[in-house]
C-alpha cells in the first residue's frame, strides 16, 4: 500500500541544491562603492533571480546559460543594504518553480560601523601578576579587531575573528592602564567602527 499517513517528501535536497550568493568586494562597504553580487548554481542554469526576502517582486533577473550570474549594484547607498537571496531555474522546470533560495547574504552599506563594547573578564580590577582578558564585542562576524592603550600610539594587539567579538590577553604586570578598541572590515575597501568607550584596568 502506498498511502502512508506521513506525507512523502521528494526529491532529496542534493537533487537540485540551493545556490551560493557572495559579494565583491565585500559584504560591508561604504556608500558609493560598486558592489557585485554573484549567484553560483551547482549546475548550469537558464535564469537567475536576485531578491530581498519579504519582497514579492524580484530585484533583478539574469538570463545566462551558465552556473554563474552577476548582479551589479552601482554606487550603493545605505538603502540598498539589507538581506539578499538568489534562486535559479531551468527551462524545463514547471512554471514558476525555482530552486530553493541561497542562504541570506547581509549587505551593509555604512560610513561607520557601530561602536563596540570593551569589557574585562573576569573584571577590571586584577590582582598583582594576574592576567586579564579584554573582550571587544561588535555586531558583525569576520572582522578585524584592534586594541589600543592610552599613551601608546601604535595598536597594542590585532585579532581577526569569525565571531562578532575578539578576546585580548593582557599579562598581569603590564595590565593596568586605560584601553579602547575598534574593529574594521578585514580587507579593502575598509570600513571602520567608532572607538569603544575606554576601560580602566587597575590593580587591587
Amino acid at each position: 500500500d502506498i498511502t502512508p499517513s506521513v506525507a512523502i517528501i521528494v526529491p532529496p535536497a542534493s537533487y537540485h541544491p540551493k545556490p551560493w550568493l557572495g559579494a565583491q568586494p565585500a559584504t560591508v562597504v561604504t556608500p558609493g562603492v560598486n558592489v557585485t553580487l554573484r549567484c553560483r548554481a551547482p549546475q548550469p542554469a537558464w535564469r537567475f533571480g536576485l531578491f530581498k526576502p519579504g519582497e514579492i517582486a524580484p530585484l533583478l533577473f539574469r538570463d545566462v546559460s551558465s552556473e554563474l550570474a552577476e548582479f551589479f549594484l552601482e554606487e550603493v547607498t545605505p538603502a540598498q543594504g539589507g538581506s539578499y537571496r538568489c534562486c535559479y531555474r531551468r527551462p524545463d522546470w514547471g512554471p514558476g518553480v525555482w530552486s530553493q533560495p541561497s542562504d541570506v547574504l547581509e549587505l551593509l552599506v555604512t560610513e561607520e560601523l557601530p561602536r563596540p563594547s570593551l569589557v574585562a573578564l573576569p573584571g577590571p580590577v586584577v590582582g598583582p601578576g594576574a592576567n586579564v582578558s579584554l573582550r571587544c564585542a561588535g555586531r558583525l562576524r569576520n572582522m578585524s579587531f584592534v586594541l589600543y592603550r592610552e599613551g601608546v600610539a601604535a595598536p597594542l594587539q590585532y585579532r581577526h575573528s569569525a565571531q562578532p567579538w575578539a578576546d585580548f590577553t593582557l599579562l598581569g604586570a603590564r595590565a593596568p592602564g586605560t584601553y579602547s578598541c575598534y574593529y574594521h572590515t578585514p580587507s579593502a575597501p575598509y570600513v571602520l567602527s567608532q572607538r569603544s568607550e575606554v576601560l580602566v584596568i587597575s590593580w587591587e
Epitope: H16, G49, I56, D92, G94, G96
Partner: antibody, heavy 117, light 109 residues
Framework: EVQLLESGGGLVQPGGSLRLSCAAS????????WTWVRQAPGKGLEWVSG???????NYAQNFQGRFTISRDNSKNTLYLQMNSLRAEDTAVYYC???????????WGQGTLVTVSS | QSVLTQPPSASGTPGQRVTISCSGS????????VSWYQQLPGTAPKLLIY???NRPSGVPNRFSGSKSGTSASLAISGLRSEDEADYYC?????????FGGGTKLTVLG
C-alpha cells in the same frame, strides 16, 4: 512532520465570495512554490493557481480575474480568495507544494466548497 | 476537455501488468517532465512518479514511469487489489500546470 491543512470551505451562494487557507508546517514555507488544485465531484484534477518563491502568481485561464492567490510567509499560510463564485466552482480544493523539476509532492487533505442557492 | 489525454478506464487481474497512457504535445510532455498520481477513493492524490521515471521513497518498484516523444506511460506490475484507484498524469507548459482526465483502474476478481 510535514503537514498541509486547508480550511475555509463551506456553502456559499452563487455570486458570493470565500477565502480558503492552507497552513503548512514542517517546511521553510517561503522557500517553495505553493499551489491550489481543485476536483469537482466525480471529476478529475484541475490546476487553479500557483504562488512562486518570488515574482507574479500564475493562474489557469478560467480563474484569472475571479480568484486571487496570496501567501503570508510569516504565518506559513497560503490563501485563495474566490470571488463571483458559480455553481461549477463546487469542488474539493487542495493545496499542494511543488517540487523540482515540476510535480506536486505534498498535498493537503482538501476542503469542500459548495456553491448553491 | 483535458489537454493531456488518458483512457478513462483500465483493468487487470491480480498479478498482471497494466499500462496507462498519457498523450500530450510538444509544448507540454514533449519538452517537459511528466508526473503520475494515485488517488484512492475519498483521499487526496499521492505522488507516484516524478521527473518521468523517478519514484518517491515509499513507492513500491512495481510502479514505473516512462516518456517517449509527446506521450508518457505508467506501468503497474504485479497488480494488487489495493492498486484500485484513479491515476492522473501531469505535466506543464510555459505558464500552466496540466492534468490528464484520469484513468480509473479496476482490479478484477
Amino acid at each position: 512532520e510535514v503537514q498541509l491543512l486547508e480550511s475555509g470551505g463551506g456553502l456559499v451562494q452563487p455570486g458570493g465570495s470565500l477565502r480558503l487557507s492552507c497552513a503548512a508546517s514542517g517546511f521553510t514555507f517561503s522557500d517553495y512554490y505553493w499551489t491550489w488544485v481543485r476536483q469537482a465531484p466525480g471529476k478529475g484534477l484541475e490546476w487553479v493557481s500557483g504562488s512562486p518563491v518570488f515574482g507574479a502568481a500564475n493562474y489557469a485561464q478560467n480563474f484569472q480575474g475571479r480568484f486571487t492567490i496570496s501567501r503570508d510567509n510569516s504565518k506559513n499560510t497560503l490563501y485563495l480568495q474566490m470571488n463571483s463564485l458559480r455553481a461549477e466552482d463546487t469542488a474539493v480544493y487542495y493545496c499542494a507544494k511543488a517540487g523540482i523539476p515540476g510535480h506536486f509532492d505534498i498535498w493537503g487533505q482538501g476542503t469542500l466548497v459548495t456553491v448553491s442557492s | 476537455q483535458s489537454v493531456l489525454t488518458q483512457p478513462p478506464s483500465a483493468s487487470g487481474t491480480p498479478g498482471q501488468r497494466v499500462t496507462i497512457s498519457c498523450s500530450g504535445s510538444s509544448s507540454n510532455i514533449g519538452n517537459n517532465y511528466v508526473s503520475w498520481y494515485q488517488q484512492l477513493p475519498g483521499t487526496a492524490p499521492k505522488l507516484l512518479i516524478y521527473g518521468n521515471s523517478n519514484r518517491p521513497s515509499g513507492v513500491p518498484n512495481r510502479f514505473s514511469g516512462s516518456k517517449s516523444g509527446t506521450s508518457a506511460s505508467l506501468a503497474i506490475s504485479g497488480l494488487r487489489s489495493e492498486d484500485e484507484a484513479d491515476y492522473y498524469c501531469q505535466s506543464y507548459d510555459s505558464s500552466s500546470w496540466l492534468f490528464g482526465g484520469g484513468t480509473k483502474l479496476t482490479v478484477l476478481g
